[in-house]
Amino acid sequence: MRRERGRQGDSSSCERQVDRVNLKPCEQHIMQRIMGEQEQYDSYDIRSTRSSDQQQRCCDELNEMENTQRCMCEALQQIMENQCDRLQDRQMVQQFKRELMNLPQQCNFRAPQRCDLDVSGGRC
């Protein structure tokens, strides 16, 4: 069930790179950190799972991209966009954004200095 590959344009662009990686472990990792003992997330039970599972795979995926501020920011923006509708209130949105901005540091990457995580047309 692999996504469609090879968007038109420069194959080394951030868009192409973000499209190739699996950001779901990053999304789960952050959701687990902010939801803790919540019942269910996506159909995957996160009640008793170690966040390190998702974090290792998440960092591996982010590491696949060129380590530029712009590409890292695009990946974080994509994660935010993917999860926006699942975040139930403003407080949860802020928590998610805070954890998201900490993600590069957790993976020992440089955090993007300016990265707008506001999702256009959404609550986020």
């Epitope: 996504r3 779901k24 789960q28 599972d53 696949e64």
Partner: antibody
Framework: EVQLVESGGGLVKPGGSLRLSCAAS????????MNWVRQAPGKGLEWVSS????????YYADSVKGRFTISRDNAKNSLHLQMNSLRDADTAVYYC????????????????WGNGTTVIVSS | EIVLTQSPGTLSLSPGERATLSCRAS???????LVWYQQKPGQAPRLLIY???TRATGIPDRFSGSGSGTDFTLTISRLEPEDFAVYYC?????????FGQGTKLEIK
């Protein structure tokens, strides 16, 4: 047709070296993480090593760490396993396996396997 | 290292019966990273279930996976003659990506 074909197995003395190769065809090799998995005679499966698409992240089983080196050549659609300081316990069928993930939910899995190449370490 | 223990080691059943195979992890594993494979003698393993419960393409619906945390189960609702094989669970979330020792499903 999506296919993985391993080669390079054979008989080698303890302490010797071998280089296994895996030729991939029928898919965009550079879009997939790759793994080596082995199976000793009459035993179960043992994961050996994995390498990500760009080779930036590599993992090894403790049993082979420091002796085996995984590598890939995306231009040639090939995966390799350099095996040094071989031991009797390394005798096994070595499988090359492609790792994919479910785009909608995220899980990873090895969905394409080669038929394996046999490595025998014996004096 | 996460150790996966499968039970029973051997399961003897007849075609038409229900098979329940267990996989227990030494530490909690996210459902996202739990996979089941089938292997027949002289063949490479074949992907059955990923994400603990999602059937791979082409796998009959008599195969189902369930569980969470440290306890996972593969169920075959009505055994067909071609289902007799060895089944392995694997976790692929945390390196090293360990396999269970396998459960051999044999004809009674």
């Amino acid at each position: 047709e999506v296919q993985l074909v391993e080669s390079g197995g054979g008989l080698v003395k303890p302490g010797g070296s071998l280089r296994l190769s895996c030729a991939a065809s029928g898919f965009i090799f550079s879009d997939y993480n790759m793994n080596w998995v082995r199976q000793a005679p009459g035993k179960g499966l043992e994961w050996v090593s994995s390498i990500t698409r760009s080779s930036r992240t590599i993992y090894y089983a403790d049993s082979v760490k420091g002796r085996f080196t995984i590598s890939r050549d995306n231009a040639k659609n090939s995966l390799h396993l350099q095996m040094n300081s071989l031991r009797d316990a390394d005798t096994a069928v070595y499988y090359c396996a492609r790792e994919d993930f479910d785009v909608s939910t995220g899980p990873y899995y090895m969905d394409v396997w080669g038929n394996g190449t046999t490595v025998i370490v014996s004096s | 290292e996460i150790v996966l223990t499968q039970s029973p080691g051997t399961l003897s059943l007849s075609p038409g019966e229900r098979a329940t195979l267990s996989c227990r992890a030494s530490q909690s594993v996210s459902n996202m990273f739990l996979v089941w494979y089938q292997q027949k003698p002289g063949q490479a393993p074949r992907l059955l279930i990923y994400g603990a419960s999602t059937r791979a393409t082409g796998i009959p619906d008599r195969f189902s996976g369930s569980g969470s945390g440290t306890d996972f189960t593969l169920t075959i609702s009505r055994l067909e003659p071609e289902d007799f094989a060895v089944y392995y669970c694997q976790q692929n979330g945390n390196s090293p990506y360990t396999f269970g020792q396998g459960t051999k499903l044999e004809i009674k």
